[in-house]
């Protein structure tokens, strides 16, 4: 089965459909897929050279 028209850009695409809690909407494939959680670490102490990088938690199967 083919996906929708490939010329359909993100700004034209239908709004993401609600997904179940363990999923999120992937604009690339325009469907709900398994998703992990994003997390932002606590800021480094004052004077630290750079902010802590944003990281992620692995998706749940």
């Amino acid at each position: 089965m083919r996906r929708g028209p490939r010329s359909l850009r993100g700004r034209d695409a239908p709004a993401p459909t609600p997904c179940v809690p363990a999923e999120c909407f992937d604009l690339l494939v325009r469907h709900c897929v398994a998703c992990g959680l994003l997390r932002t670490p606590r800021p480094k102490p004052a004077g630290a050279s750079s902010p802590a990088p944003r990281t992620a938690l692995q998706p749940q199967e």
Epitope: M1, R2, R3, R6, L8, R9, G10, R11, A13, P16, P18, C19, C24, F25, D26, L27, L28, V29, R30, H31, V33, A34, C35, G36, L37, L38, R54, A56, L57, Q58, P59, E61
Partner: antibody, heavy 125, light 107 residues
Framework: EVQLVESGGGLVQPGGSLRLSCAAS????????IHWVRQAPGKGLEWVAW????????DYADSVKGRFTISADTSKNTAYLQMNSLRAEDTAVYYC??????????????????WGQGTLVTVSS | DIQMTQSPSSLSASVGDRVTITCRAS??????VAWYQQKPGKAPKLLIF???YLFSGVPSRFSGSGSGTDFTLTISSLQPEDFATYYC?????????FGQGTKVEIK
């Protein structure tokens, strides 16, 4: 441990066919999209196709549309790339990769986190 | 299709240098950009996704920034193992095209 293993590459004459396989372990392919990416000798990465096994959605690069078919068998946890009408310019290492997604405001933020080792396809007479 | 243009195509740098690679999209891709590192004969490795998120296990000397059409990968202090080719890729819409690559060589 997540692993992707490609197979099926080899030497084929122009106009010929090959079927590549991408066997997944450590995760179920129905939970994400699987992509084929190729790299011609000394060149950069070129995305080829993707499949969303849970629903059968697919898409292709213009350069292979009508000649290549991507598919998946969730019971075997394996994705495939059927390559027909092969041309010399299809000569490349073919990688399969999993797209990982993280939830950012309900939308996927992601990239291709696991890749196979690659399989070489040579199209030559 | 959205085109991704990387610059420079190659650069020479020394261990300890700060290295910046840029990627420009032909259309707005929001923050849907990933960066990969590839060494000869090996599969690419994911470094950064969603423009600025560091992938698990990637050293913190790598960072990404940008949104819309202009994106940057920065290596704050180049290490010997960082000499490789780097690619950007968007995933805002299909097809998810790659940049042409930037080869980081030893000066």
């Amino acid at each position: 441990e997540v692993q992707l293993v490609e197979s099926g590459g080899g030497l084929v004459q122009p106009g010929g066919s090959l079927r590549l396989s991408c066997a997944a372990s450590g995760f179920t392919i129905s939970s994400s999209s699987i992509h084929w990416v190729r790299q011609a000798p000394g060149k950069g990465l070129e995305w080829v196709a993707w499949v969303l096994p849970s629903v059968g959605f697919t898409d292709y690069a213009d350069s292979v549309k009508g000649r290549f078919t991507i598919s998946a068998d969730t019971s075997k946890n394996t994705a495939y790339l059927q390559m027909n009408s092969l041309r010399a310019e299809d000569t490349a290492v073919y990688y399969c990769a999993r797209r990982v997604c993280y939830n950012r405001l309900g939308v996927c933020a992601g990239g291709m986190d696991y890749w196979g080792q690659g399989t070489l396809v040579t199209v030559s007479s | 299709d959205i085109q991704m243009t990387q610059s420079p195509s190659s650069l020479s740098a020394s261990v300890g240098d700060r290295v910046t690679i840029t990627c420009r999209a032909s259309e707005d891709v929001s923050s849907a950009v990933a960066w990969y590192q590839q060494k000869p004969g090996k599969a690419p490795k994911l470094l950064i996704f969603a423009a600025s998120y560091l992938f698990s296990g990637v050293p913190s000397r790598f960072s990404g920034s940008g949104s819309g059409t202009d994106f940057t990968l920065t290596i704050s202090s180049l290490q010997p193992e960082d000499f490789a080719t780097y690619y950007c890729q968007h995933s805002q819409v299909s097809p998810p095209t790659f940049g042409q690559g930037t080869k980081v060589e030893i000066k």
